[in-house]
Interface confidence: medium
């Protein structure tokens, strides 16, 4: 069946960048790193300089729900985290600038950001039951839960 967002006409408008140059660590204290030009993976690092630094941009939706909707960009690049399907790796999509408005199939660029204590979860707007996740010996992907790890700690001000 078509993803939830594609069936609705919700429009997401860019507000502002709300976090700059932060690191995402999973529950095993693995940091997200670049696997190659297209994919991300997770690894335990001694030196956090090797971790990917992300910027987070906030969007507000036309249906005015209370969910916090964000885009994730690799800092100092034009690469944006993009969801595919379940158990598929998230892609890094190059765009000339941050989209001012997102709707329809482009919602694969957006994630609902939820926090519970120090745990942060990023649910795909295009696939609302799937989270950004790390998986042993695999790329950062979309997953519904275990054995993939779906909770992250945000490490700020690592520069």
């Amino acid at each position: 069946s078509a993803p939830f967002s594609f069936l609705s006409n919700v429009k997401y408008n860019f507000m502002r960048i709300i976090k700059y140059e932060f690191i995402l660590n999973d529950a095993l204290n693995q940091s997200i790193i670049r696997a190659n030009d297209q994919y991300l993976t997770a690894a335990a690092l001694h030196n956090l300089d090797e971790a990917v630094k992300f910027d987070m941009g906030a969007y507000k939706s036309s249906k005015d729900d209370a969910k916090i909707t964000v885009i994730l960009r690799i800092s100092k690049t034009q690469l944006y985290v993009t969801a595919q399907d379940e158990d598929q790796p998230v892609l890094l999509k190059e765009m000339p600038e941050i989209p001012k408005t997102i709707t329809g199939s482009e919602t694969n660029l957006l994630f609902f950001w939820e926090t519970h204590g120090t745990k942060n979860y990023f649910t795909s707007v295009a696939h609302p039951n799937l989270f950004i996740a790390t998986k042993q010996d695999y790329w950062v992907c979309l997953a519904g839960g275990p054995p993939s790890i779906t909770d992250f700690q945000i490490l700020e001000n690592q520069a």
Epitope: M15, R16, I17, I18, K19, Y20, E21, A58, D64, D65, A66, I68, W113, T115, E156, N157, A159
Partner: antibody
Framework: EVQLVQSGAEVKKPGASVKVSCKAS????????MNWVRQAPGQGLERMGW????????TYADDFKGRVTFTLDTSTSTAYMELSSLRSEDTAVYYC???????????????WGQGTTVTVSS | DIQMTQSPSSLSASVGDRVTITCRAS??????LNWYQQKPGKAPKLLIY???RLKPGVPSRFSGSGSGTDYTFTISSLQPEDIATYFC?????????FGQGTKLEIK
């Protein structure tokens, strides 16, 4: 320890301009926007706008557009607010306040300067 | 602009009392509400963000609740050092307006 230290009190004549400084320390300046808020004597708080310290881009509240300018000196981690064409009703305490995006609250202000009193009088 | 209306504008209470302040928004602000404390001659301090989340280091006697347009700030047991003016602020839509403040005094 996060600190925002503002410049001293100013007395200005109507029609003049005033420039208030806000020197930040104890954190990475570029990662947190800077808001400017004013408080007239015995009154509430009025947000004048903010400057993105990462990009230098300013956003001004409608009531201040055309009269206020926010600038930065990133080398000294200092933000500035200049208000022109001063009138008596601009007499107020002016605060800088660090912007933090706490989860779910756009533009929460978690650390504030001590305030700068600006008096406009002929 | 979203209007924020606080009540009461002032109140007097005794040490140990439970104190409640309300804040009403002119439209739904989706829980994006902050509370600040301002002591005389000092700058405001952030106490609560996103309706009910305490800023780290803020005593647990302070709490917040609400949804939609109606929000409440509570001090469960008033302490002498809580004498201040309290402001709500909506974090939903620019220009991120404040309530007019509630001045809290000790009986």
């Amino acid at each position: 320890e996060v600190q925002l230290v503002q410049s001293g009190a100013e007395v200005k004549k109507p029609g003049a301009s005033v420039k208030v400084s806000c020197k930040a320390s104890g954190y990475t300046f570029k990662y947190y926007g800077m808001n400017w808020v004013r408080q007239a004597p015995g009154q509430g708080l009025e947000r004048m706008g903010w400057i993105n310290t990462y990009t230098g881009q300013s956003t001004y509240a409608d009531d201040f557009k055309g009269r206020v300018t926010f600038t930065l000196d990133t080398s000294t981690s200092t933000a500035y607010m200049e208000l022109s064409s001063l009138r008596s009703e601009d007499t107020a305490v002016y605060y800088c306040a660090r912007d933090i995006y706490y989860y779910g609250s756009d533009f929460a202000m978690d650390y504030w300067g001590q305030g700068t009193t600006v008096t406009v009088s002929s | 602009d979203i209007q924020m209306t606080q009540s009461p504008s002032s109140l007097s209470a005794s040490v140990g009392d439970r104190v409640t302040i309300t804040c009403r928004a002119s439209q739904d602000i989706s829980n994006m509400l902050n509370w600040y404390q301002q002591k005389p001659g000092k700058a405001p301090k952030l106490l609560i963000y996103y309706t009910s989340r305490l800023k780290p280091g803020v005593p647990s006697r302070f709490s917040g609740s609400g949804s939609g347009t109606d929000y409440t700030f509570t001090i469960s047991s008033l302490q002498p050092e809580d004498i201040a003016t309290y402001f709500c602020q909506q974090g939903k839509t620019a220009p991120y307006t404040f309530g007019q403040g509630t001045k809290l005094e000790i009986k």
